[in-house]
Interface confidence: medium
């Protein structure tokens, strides 16, 4: 089940998933001047068996200049921030993802991918928060959020984190 909303926004903080639950999708987005290859995958999908999870499909980008017909509209960075985004370069150190059955590791970068990754999370996904550079964390509880299903609706738990200057 897809999570209907984005993880909560915490002022001066970013979130990151350490591993991705099966069913998670990652958009195949290309940086400006590039597009998905013709009939290329729309997204990668975390799939797996009881013993192993991996990403279906590969994202591939090619120069927009090589195509004369249709043009893919790539979201601008300010548009991307409205959706579930995870910055590629994160100062967080991932946990041992191999120890999480039913989860995929962070997919390796593909050539000419967009600067931000757009994930579509599923129920049960956990994301972790940390303060951006120049801010320090005041913890009142776990600095994490989980997508939960309650009464047929999805919601993210509120992370107990305040970032102060």
């Amino acid at each position: 089940e897809l999570c209907d909303d984005d993880p909560p926004e915490i002022p001066h903080a970013t979130f990151k998933a350490m591993a991705y639950k099966e069913g998670t999708m990652l958009n195949c987005e290309c940086k400006r001047g590039f597009r998905r290859i013709k009939s290329g995958s729309l997204y990668m999908l975390c799939t797996g068996s009881s013993s192993h999870s991996s990403w279906d499909n590969q994202c591939q980008c090619t120069s927009s200049a090589t195509r004369s017909t249709t043009k893919q509209v790539t979201p601008q960075p300010e548009e991307q921030k409205e959706r579930k985004t995870t910055e590629m370069q994160s100062p967080m150190q991932p946990v041992d993802q191999a120890s999480l059955p039913g989860h995929c590791r962070e997919p390796p970068p593909w050539e000419n991918e967009a600067t931000e990754r757009i994930y579509h999370f599923v129920v049960g996904q956990m994301v972790y928060y940390q303060c951006v550079q120049g801010y320090r964390a005041l913890h009142r509880g776990p600095a994490e959020s989980v997508c939960k299903m309650t009464h047929g609706k999805t919601r993210w738990t509120q992370p107990q984190l305040i970032c102060t200057g």
């Epitope: 897809l2 729309l42 999908l45 409205e82 579930k84 579509h120 999370f121």
Partner: antibody, heavy 119, light 107 residues
Framework: QVQLQESGSGLVKPSQTLSLTCAVS??????????WSWIRQPPGKGLEWIGY???????YYNPSLKSRVTISVDRSKNQFSLKLSSVTAADTAVYYC???????????WGQGTTVTVSS | DIVMTQTPSSLSASVGDRVAITCQAS??????VNWYQQKPGEAPRLLIY???TLQRGVPSRFSGSGSGTGFTLTINSLQPEDFATYFC?????????FGGGTRVDIK
């Protein structure tokens, strides 16, 4: 429970522009993980995907219609719209809007609206 | 474009029958296939997504199988309300494409 409702002109003259709107209720068009699609079905025929839009405004169109199609979103009104220019009789169809969860399929559909192109 | 070839285009069956509809993709699309049911005058209804996962609220007599290029929708013990047209759809890449449809009517 998310519901979709199409509205717009049921009769369009050839060479004019078809305009339809899909109102989203019971949920936000800004919900993550979904795109918002237009699909059409000519009388007695199969389904044809026209295109879809993210709430951010990023669009993907069917190349066969791309030169004539514009899909836009109005987050303040919780709706998205379809414009199809230079219509001909071949554009006569039932037009559906749908919520698409990519791998997860088009799980919510409008009831459809019939558009006839005729002078 | 990925072409989805659906067979048969129509079939006649009786209540209680087991019915199978197949969809062939023109190239490998993993399990990125969805199945829909459409009744006259109504919008399509999602039955199966991801080739084999039953959509919430859909009776368990419907099942989907296959991956790669070959996919099957099976209806076990056909019920009166199942007489309709069925479509497959690939969600692997744009343009999103549908099969031509299979009309299931009463024998």
């Amino acid at each position: 429970q998310v519901q979709l409702q199409e509205s717009g002109s049921g009769l369009v003259k050839p060479s004019q522009t078809l305009s339809l709107t899909c109102a989203v209720s019971g949920g936000s068009i800004s919900s993550g993980g979904y795109s918002w699609s237009w699909i059409r079905q000519p009388p007695g025929k199969g389904l044809e995907w026209i295109g879809y839009i993210y709430h951010s405004g990023s669009t993907y169109y069917n190349p066969s219609l791309k030169s004539r199609v514009t899909i836009s979103v109005d987050r303040s009104k919780n709706q998205f719209s379809l414009k199809l220019s230079s219509v001909t009789a071949a554009d006569t169809a039932v037009y559906y809007c749908a919520r698409a969860g990519y791998y997860y399929g088009m799980d919510v559909w409008g009831q459809g609206t019939t558009v006839t192109v005729s002078s | 474009d990925i072409v989805m070839t659906q067979t048969p285009s129509s079939l006649s069956a009786s209540v209680g029958d087991r019915v199978a509809i197949t969809c062939q993709a023109s190239r490998n699309i993993w399990s990125y296939v969805n199945w829909y049911q459409q009744k006259p005058g109504e919008a399509p209804r999602l039955l199966i997504y991801g080739a084999s996962t039953l959509q919430r609220g859909v009776p368990s007599r419907f099942s989907g199988s296959g991956s790669g290029t070959g996919f099957t929708l099976t209806i076990n013990s056909l019920q009166p309300e199942d007489f309709a047209t069925y479509f497959c759809q690939q969600s692997h890449s744009t343009p999103i494409t549908f099969g031509g449809g299979t009309r299931v009517d009463i024998k």
